[in-house]
């Protein structure tokens, strides 16, 4: 599965999307940064097998989806960027999803890391939290589209690496 | 190799006008703010201003507004420090330092080798 | 702004002692302050970044803690290329400022 070629230009264009997102200027929010204990151990790529690795990948974008569903989202965001940011959300599941299909059978390992899913659901349960605990402030949000865009470039390293693989 | 390159040492008269740059390379220019620094001879540090080049927002210290213009070319990866009329009181190393926005990240992590800038009748 | 007040100015030490310096806020900054260190005709480096996080590549004699208005750097065991001028610095708002330095010389 060549997953760069049909993933890594949707993957620029979220971070493109969510770049023009922001309503405030951040500098109005320095005091509001936080340390969400991004699991970058898990975006390393070293101990995965691809299709374990693809799979952090599609938890990661699945649970950035599911943060931009709520309606708390829909109230912050540009409804036209929140449209296209789903879209191009959506097209990367799909090939992951793809990817994942052509995995099996390939690898003798487990599709799944289930304890590397689990760090990635419980990132994003920081991140809700935060929001929680912020009330859904503007500058919350503004922390979390930072946050966001850090981690998709952050995975898209461990793209660049799936791909060297191959 | 992250890297932050400033321009070369200026000599100039009172009156003048002067930009100084900072170019980054190594990284993704739009990820991170670009910080300005004072150091006058013998003294200690002065924040100066801060732009983000990803849509050219600024914020300047109350010390410096209305004195210098902090501006950013994401074309070229390149940040900028500008005087319309130099005084004296401008002689100083001049810094630009990357810092992480609003991400949980090192402030200020790396830094330009520093111009020196010289205003002298 | 935020006034930040670094002591003392100065300190004359030898290598191998235990060196701290201090930094108060004039109000909580919660644990954002940087430590830098330069040395003459240098671009500062950073040491220590959210009050007590090692910056990449610092050796590990150097520490940072502190919350709120009350930080310290510390050098376990004082070494010949750590005399220098140290800098504390506010990241909690804008517009970030920093102590006035304090220069660690050889005794």
């Known amino acids: 599965c060549d997953l760069p070629q049909t993933h890594s230009l949707s993957n620029r264009r979220t971070l493109m999307i969510m770049a023009q997102m922001g309503r405030i200027s951040p500098f109005s929010c320095l005091k509001d940064r936080h340390d969400f204990g991004f699991p970058q151990e898990e975006f390393d790529g070293n101990q995965f097998q691809k299709a374990q690795a693809i799979s952090v990948l599609h938890e990661m974008i699945q649970q950035t989806f599911n943060l931009f569903s709520t309606k708390d989202s829909s109230a912050t965001w540009d409804e036209t960027l929140l449209d296209k940011f789903y879209t191009e959300l959506y097209q990367q599941l799909n090939d992951l999803e793809a990817c994942m299909m052509q995995e099996v059978g390939v690898e003798d390992t487990p599709l799944m890391n289930v304890d590397s899913i689990l760090t990635v659901r419980k990132y994003f349960q920081r991140i809700t939290l935060y929001l929680t605990e912020k009330k859904y402030s503007p500058c919350a949000w503004e922390v979390v589209r930072a946050e966001i865009m850090r981690s998709f470039s952050l995975s898209a390293n461990l793209q660049e690496r799936l791909r060297r693989k191959e | 190799e992250v890297q932050l390159v400033q321009s070369g040492a200026e000599v100039k008269k009172p009156g003048e006008s002067l930009k100084i740059s900072c170019k980054g390379s190594g990284y993704s220019f739009t990820s991170y703010w670009i910080g300005w620094v004072r150091q006058m001879p013998g003294k200690g540090l002065e924040w100066m201003g801060i732009i983000d080049p990803s849509d050219s927002d600024t914020r300047y210290s109350p010390s410096f507004q209305g004195q210098v213009t902090i501006s950013a070319d994401k074309s070229i990866s390149t940040a900028y420090l500008q005087w319309s009329s130099l005084k004296a009181s401008d002689t100083a190393m001049y810094y630009c330092a990357r810092h992480p926005g609003l991400n949980w990240a090192p402030d200020f992590d790396y830094w330009g080798q520093g111009t020196l800038v010289t205003v002298s009748s | 702004d935020i006034q930040m007040t670094q002591s003392p100015s100065s300190l004359s030490a030898s290598v191998g002692d235990r060196v701290t310096i201090t930094c108060r806020a004039s109000q909580s900054i919660d644990r954002a302050l940087n430590w830098y260190q330069q040395k003459p005709g240098k671009a500062p480096k950073l040491l220590i970044y959210f009050a007590s996080s090692l910056q990449s590549g610092v050796p590990s004699r150097f520490s940072g803690s502190g919350s709120g208005t009350d930080f310290t750097l510390t050098i376990s065991s004082l070494q010949p290329e750590d005399f220098a001028t140290y800098y504390c610095?506010?990241?909690?708002?804008?517009?970030?400022?920093f102590g006035q330095g304090t220069k660690v010389e050889i005794k």
């Open positions: 610095q506010q990241s909690f708002d804008f517009p970030l400022t």
